[in-house]
């Protein structure tokens, strides 16, 4: 007996009703008294619904299933599943027996749209260029797990310094929290996009941060135009300098060196203190020269993997940055 079901999964939204289609071809003279129909969970073999001895035997699955009794005689053995829950997701097998026997399995894919993300900033006031800000994007009550993407105002993906967590509630729906850490530039737009991979539904929110600028204008940060060439195993100095104003003290200085592309932290000086190397303990500043505006970085025992662009961020009252390339030979 040939039993037919859809090849593709049946996608159903949480809380709605779903029809799991199943059909067979009745022979001439077929009567329902001859029909044995069983729906069961494919993996556990748990009975879901049955029709036998000419009668609907009812739901064995939380009283949320029904057949289409008026259509059975025409070969329609479909099952209606009401008020779909996340726990219903999976494979259902439709067994049909008349004189002969056939079966086929249909997949139910459950989905729930994610809410429009809400965005929060920490800190959220008195922001200045050079400050590190944590932006949190939260979206709720979706299923299955989301894909989360961050972009800047021109659509450039922001992939570094992102942490995403997804927690299921009692109903199995996910709440998504994604955190992006950024060093503020002059101003910037940050967008968070939460994508439901089953529904192909994109929910997005943006925040534009315009830091306060001091009247003096940006800090001018200077680096060499040409790449710094260093031999493998030797030490390299990535030069970076700024012009301190009269009365400048190191307590005012925030200095961050990071990899330009990935934004990975390399070395920092904040709150009047050298915060040390975040890069394999092979970097050092020139502490005695910082007060004169020398923010250069020493990179020890250069490796091939060090090659690339390093950005020097300097923030005093205002902010400036510049990138220097390291070429390894």
């Amino acid at each position: 007996l040939e039993v037919q079901v859809p090849e593709d999964p049946v996608v159903a939204l949480v809380g709605t009703d779903a029809t799991l289609c199943c059909s067979f071809s009745p022979e001439p003279g077929f009567s329902l008294a001859q029909l044995n129909l069983i729906w069961q969970l494919t993996d556990t073999k748990q009975l879901v619904h049955s029709f036998a001895e000419g009668q609907d035997q009812g739901s064995a699955y939380a009283n949320r299933t029904a057949l289409f009794p008026d259509l059975l005689a025409q070969g329609n053995a479909s099952l209606r599943l009401q008020r779909v829950r996340v726990a219903d997701e999976g494979s259902f097998t439709c067994f049909v027996s008349i004189r002969d026997f056939g079966s086929a399995a249909v997949s139910l894919q459950v989905a729930a749209p994610y809410s429009k993300p809400s965005m929060t900033l920490e800190p959220n006031k008195d922001l200045r260029p050079g400050d590190t800000v944590t932006i949190t994007c939260s979206s709720y009550q979706g299923y299955p797990e989301a894909e989360v993407f961050w972009q800047d105002g021109q659509g450039v993906p922001l992939t570094g310094n992102v942490t995403t967590s997804q927690m299921a509630n009692e109903q199995g729906l996910f709440d998504v929290h994604s955190i992006l850490r950024v060093v503020l530039g002059a101003n910037g737009t940050y967008s968070c996009l939460v994508r439901n991979p089953v529904l192909q539904q994109d929910a997005h929110s943006s925040v534009t941060i315009t830091p306060q600028r001091s009247p003096t204008g940006a800090v001018e940060v200077q680096v060499p135009e040409d790449p710094v060439v260093a031999l493998v195993g030797t030490d390299a100095t990535l030069r970076c300098s700024f012009s301190p104003e009269p009365g400048f003290s190191l307590a005012q200085l925030n200095l961050i060196w990071q990899l330009t592309d990935t934004k990975q932290l390399v070395h920092s000086f904040t709150e009047g203190r050298d915060q040390g190397s975040a890069y394999a303990n092979r970097t050092a500043l020139f502490p005695d020269l910082l007060a004169q505006g020398n923010a250069s970085l020493r990179l020890q025992r250069v490796r091939v993997a060090d090659e690339g662009s390093f950005t020097c961020f300097v923030s005093i009252r205002d902010f400036g940055s510049a990138a220097v390339s390291l070429q390894v030979a």
């Epitope: 021109q154 450039v156 993906p157 994109d202």
Partner: antibody
Framework: QVQLQQSGPELVRPGVSVKISCKVS????????MHWVKRSHAKSLEWIGI????????NYNQKFQGKATMTVDKSSSTAYMELARLTSEDSAIYYC???????????????WGQGTLVTVSA | DVQITQSPSYLTASPGETIIINCRAS??????LAWYQEKPGKTNKLLIY???TLQSGIPSRFSGSGSDTDFTLTISSLEPEDFAMYYC?????????FGAGTKLELK
């Protein structure tokens, strides 16, 4: 009208670097991101990366990480791409392209440069 | 990465005919697909984005359809200037990826 004018062809030796440029006219340079695309016989079209023309923020196709470096000069409305440690596999036409995105995670290209042919040969 | 399979790689037709080019994605990409035309000595031209949205200035004989994984570019009543190379590109996610191209030649 919108134009992306790329620098001329380059014939370079293996192992060296080359920097190609893309000068924009007909729209405000910093209004949208710039992408770079490689066209070779072996691999057809390959997306290299994207740069924010305002902030300089970049994102690279992992395949081109370490090979390509994108930069911009806002004062001259020019985007640059440097290709390092060239080999024969880098011989190709390189295009700059103005990206368009609409709240999705991806972009399409409304305008293209005419392409820069890079030939790597000893 | 999303792989894009474009077919056919080569196509011959005559002016006035209708042709169809197909692109298939290795995973569902909703309707995030663009089509381009490439001609020697000219800059690449965007024809269609988001599966079926015609770029301004492109003649209506070009149309795009499809969603999820299967997409088509249809050119009806071919004009002499339509003989060119055509590429599709997914703009669903990074890295952006292209089909291998279809060369449309005069029969």
């Amino acid at each position: 009208q919108v134009q992306l004018q790329q620098s001329g062809p380059e014939l370079v030796r293996p192992g060296v670097s080359v920097k190609i440029s893309c000068k924009v006219s007909g729209y405000t340079f910093t209004d949208g991101a710039m992408h770079w695309v490689k066209r070779s016989h072996a691999k057809s079209l390959e997306w290299i990366g994207i740069i924010n023309t305002n902030s300089g923020n970049t994102n690279y196709n992992q395949k081109f990480q370490g090979k390509a470096t994108m930069t911009v000069d806002k004062s001259s409305s020019t985007a640059y791409m440097e290709l390092a440690r060239l080999t024969s596999e880098d011989s190709a036409i390189y295009y700059c392209a103005r990206g368009v995105f609409y709240y999705g995670y991806g972009a399409w290209f409304a305008y293209w440069g005419q392409g820069t042919l890079v030939t790597v040969s000893a | 990465d999303v792989q894009i399979t474009q077919s056919p790689s080569y196509l011959t037709a005559s002016p006035g005919e209708t042709i169809i080019i197909n692109c298939r994605a290795s995973k569902t990409i909703s309707n995030y697909l663009a089509w381009y035309q490439e001609k020697p000595g000219k800059t690449n031209k965007l024809l269609i984005y988001s599966g079926s949205t015609l770029q301004s200035g492109i003649p209506s004989r070009f149309s795009g359809s499809g969603s999820d994984t299967d997409f088509t570019l249809t050119i009806s009543s071919l004009e002499p200037e339509d003989f060119a190379m055509y590429y599709c590109q997914q703009h669903h996610e990074y890295p952006l990826t292209f089909g291998a191209g279809t060369k449309l030649e005069l029969k």
